[in-house]
């Protein structure tokens, strides 16, 4: 019963962690304009990894896409690879995970052949979290970085001086669904890696062999023989531990300019 | 179509209050900015602030902070902006605007002139 | 705040002529986040209110006679009418888009020649 809720927890879990990571991925708020010298702006800019965008104040949205891959920041194209790195290993985690799932019956499958699909997906989910939180991490770095770096600097132009102040950008949404995501995942990745471990077929066989001594009736029954096969395919008498007595799972955002009301 | 209209011209003395109101229509009230844009005898243009007809949120000039004051009336699609303790500088027209894309003002009203004499 | 300056104060073409009105921007208007600049060029004429003319720097607005254009990008904008008609007699204003408060140029009068 524990196994199988062990699995079936971290399954949800992966499931949560890489649907926050598909989102994260698709999001366009990765770097919001910072607002901490001006909480109130005309223009509100904030950048995904697809996209770019600006917030009018008067309530319309423009996102510009990045229609160029050479010109791109090599971080930016290295971020985008870890995403979607782990978007293809979780997505495929997930389908080896239902295959692998205790309460899901597929012909006359192997406990043994489930709890190498167990492990193989929990690997993949702890890898898949990994390149997610790595991804995210390597884009705040880079906010930061130019967080400090981008000060307002001044030009003489006509009529004086001009003032062109960059935009400064911090921590969007995006790098929190990401990070929360990329946990989640791993998280769910170990649960699946500790269900494996309940999973797999520990076998203990004993084999019953009896010396008939001619005036003595006595049965000798020595310590039990450890079947040392692995995942084992001792299919005579095969016992896989199940943590305890269980009964098996029943479970089988422009508006038109003349829109009227 | 889309329209602005404003109330009529108002005299008003020294100190006293004003309250300019602008009725739209053919367009959906709630999903646009209403701004408000002053204009004195021979001058340029100068901005006042703006209110959101859907949550009353307002922006607003810090010049005009402690001048203007402004409102909605949704039921009506009627902006309001209230001038308190006007001076003979107030005397102007007193546009109001709807805003569009590139934070531009598409439409406006046909505007109120305010004269402030004693 | 953002401080618009046009020039120049006034102008006489005669018809049929170009005419040029800039803009000088105290700040970039230019926003980021999509690559536009937040200019807007209004024509006001005596006893009306003002008119969209242009917006994001180079965007007609609809029903705006293609005779009028907008460019210019960062701080520096400019509105050029291609062929001054008697209609186009009024004053022009440049507004910053870009940050609160939003600002206007002191207006350049267009006269005929």
């Known amino acids: 019963m524990a196994v199988t809720a062990c699995q079936g927890l971290g399954f949800v879990v992966s499931l949560i962690g890489i649907a926050g990571i598909i989102a994260a991925t698709c999001m366009d708020q990765w770097s919001t304009q910072d607002l901490y010298n001006n909480p109130v702006t005309a223009v509100f800019n904030y950048q995904g990894l697809w996209r770019s965008c600006v917030r009018e104040s008067s309530g319309f949205t423009e996102c510009r896409g990045y229609f160029t891959l050479l010109g791109l920041p090599a971080m930016l194209q290295a971020v985008r690879a870890l995403m979607i790195v782990g978007i293809v290993l979780g997505a495929i985690g997930l389908l080896v995970s239902i295959f692998a799932l205790k309460c899901i019956r597929i012909g006359s499958m192997e406990d043994s052949a489930k709890a190498n699909m167990t492990l193989t997906s929990g690997i993949m989910f702890i890898v898949s979290g990994l390149c997610a939180i790595a991804g995210v991490s390597v884009f705040a770095n880079m906010l930061v970085t130019n967080f400090w770096m981008s000060t307002a600097n001044m030009y003489t132009g006509m009529g004086g001086m001009v003032q062109t102040v960059q935009t400064r950008y911090t921590f969007g949404a995006a790098l929190f669904v990401g990070w929360v995501a990329g946990g989640l995942t791993l998280i769910g990745g170990v649960m699946m890696c500790i269900a494996c471990r309940g999973l797999a077929p520990e076998e203990t066989n004993y084999k019953a062999v009896s010396y008939h001594a001619s005036g003595h009736s006595v049965a000798y029954k020595p310590g039990g023989f450890k079947a040392s096969t692995g995942f084992g395919s001792n299919t005579k008498n095969k016992k896989i531990y199940d943590g305890g007595a269980r009964t098996e799972d029943e479970v089988q955002s422009y508006p038109s300019k003349h829109d009227y009301v | 179509q889309v329209q602005l209209v404003q109330s009529g011209a108002e005299v008003k003395k020294p100190g006293a209050s004003v309250k300019v109101s602008c009725k739209a229509s053919g367009y959906s009230f709630t999903n646009y900015w209403v701004n408000w844009v002053r204009q004195a005898p021979g001058q340029g243009l100068e901005w006042i602030g703006m209110?959101?007809?859907?949550?009353?949120?307002?922006r607003l000039n810090q010049q005009f902070k402690d001048k203007a004051t402004l409102t909605v009336d949704k039921s009506t699609s009627t902006a309001y902006m209230e001038l308190s303790s006007l001076r003979s500088e107030d005397t102007a027209v007193y546009y109001c605007?709807?805003?569009?894309?590139?934070?531009?003002?598409?439409?406006w009203g046909q505007g109120t002139l305010v004269t402030v004499s004693s | 705040d953002i401080v618009m300056t046009q020039s120049p104060d006034s102008l006489a073409v005669s018809l049929g002529e170009r005419a040029t009105i800039n803009c000088l921007s105290s700040q970039s208007l230019l926003a980021s986040g999509n690559q536009r600049n937040y200019l807007t060029w209004y024509q006001q004429k005596p006893g009306q209110p003002p008119k969209l003319l242009i917006y994001?720097?180079?965007t007609r607005d609809s029903g705006v006679p293609d005779r009028f254009s907008g460019s210019g990008s960062g701080v520096d904008f400019t509105l050029t009418i291609s062929s001054v008609q008697a209609e186009d007699v009024a004053v022009y204003y440049c507004?910053?888009?870009?940050?609160?408060?939003?600002?206007f140029g002191q207006g350049t009068k267009l006269e005929i020649k």
């Open positions: 994001w720097a180079s």
């Open positions: 605007a709807r805003v569009w894309s590139g934070n531009a003002f598409d439409y």
């Open positions: 209110v959101h007809p859907s949550g009353s949120e307002t």
């Open positions: 507004q910053n888009g870009f940050s609160f408060p939003f600002t």
